[in-house]
């Protein structure tokens, strides 16, 4: 396994509809035609997997049908969006990549971005 | 849209030097990330080094780590290849490449790079 660079925003507020996006990029070594890119969360020490997609150089990348994240990738950048976000799922959201294919192996992991999530106020009742 | 041109080819004996230089018209450099790529008569194009937006961050693959030096002044809009004990093997067409990213990080595949150069050739032979 060799360290790759992966760079990430440090912040990212969401939308008042609960959407986050960011951008995820590396720096590839060399002509990688299959990579992996993973969204990790971590919140009090835990860290869980929030989705996860493989993709092949030059092809979108597909999340599972009910991922809560979306993507696109163009060369070494990676646009992910995280849809459904709530004010508890505020956190440090990682980004990780791993270039699956032709060997070697690369992992990149970044620092994170911060998502902060604020959910809306309800709109007060209108005597109209 | 972003053109580029590569310039400083030529013949050279081993052990000598180059600077090629890499000149972009059409959109300001420091928006990419650039690569330089080499190509030798009946072989696959191979990456020889990359740099950043910013200048901070490079790659070299091993072949030319330590010979070659990539650099870059945005005020000119240039990318510079500085290749020092040069060798036989080290003959092929230079071509510089750029992909436009956000950060400050760049790639040594050629698969990332959108817009390419025509290319300078650089011989090393005595």
């Known amino acids: 396994c060799k360290a790759m660079h992966v760079a990430q925003p440090a912040v990212v507020l969401a939308s008042s509809r609960g959407i986050a996006s960011f951008v995820c990029e590396y720096a590839s070594p060399g002509k990688a035609t299959e990579v992996r890119v993973t969204v990790l969360r971590q919140a009090d020490s835990q860290v869980t997997e929030v989705c996860a997609a493989t993709y092949m150089m030059g092809n979108e990348l597909t999340f599972l049908d009910d991922s809560i994240c979306t993507g696109t990738s163009s060369g070494n950048q990676v646009n992910l969006t995280i849809q459904g976000l709530r004010a508890m799922d505020t956190g440090l959201y990682i980004c990780k990549v791993e270039l699956m294919y032709p060997p070697p192996y690369y992992l990149g992991i970044g620092n994170g971005t911060q998502i902060y999530v604020i959910d809306p106020e309800p709109c007060p009742d209108s005597d109209f | 849209e972003v053109q580029l041109v590569e310039s400083g080819g030529g013949l050279v004996q081993p052990g000598g030097s180059l600077r090629l230089s890499c000149a972009a018209s059409?959109?300001?450099?420091?928006?990419?990330?650039v690569g330089w790529f080499r190509q030798a008569p009946g072989k696959e194009r191979e990456e020889v080094a990359c740099?950043?937006?910013?200048?901070?961050?490079?790659d070299y693959p091993g072949s030319v780590k330590g010979r070659f030096t990539i650099s870059r002044d945005n005020s000119k809009n240039t990318v510079y290849l500085q290749m020092n004990s040069l060798r036989a093997e080290d003959t092929a067409v230079y071509y510089c490449?750029?992909?436009?990213?956000?950060?400050?990080?760049?790639?040594?595949?050629?698969?990332?790079?959108?817009?390419w150069g025509q290319g300078t050739q650089v011989t090393v032979s005595s």
């Open positions: 740099i950043g937006r910013t200048g901070e961050f490079t």
């Open positions: 490449a750029a992909e436009r990213l956000v950060f400050h990080l760049c790639s040594l595949s050629e698969y990332d790079y959108d817009t």
């Open positions: 059409g959109d300001t450099l420091e928006s990419f990330a």
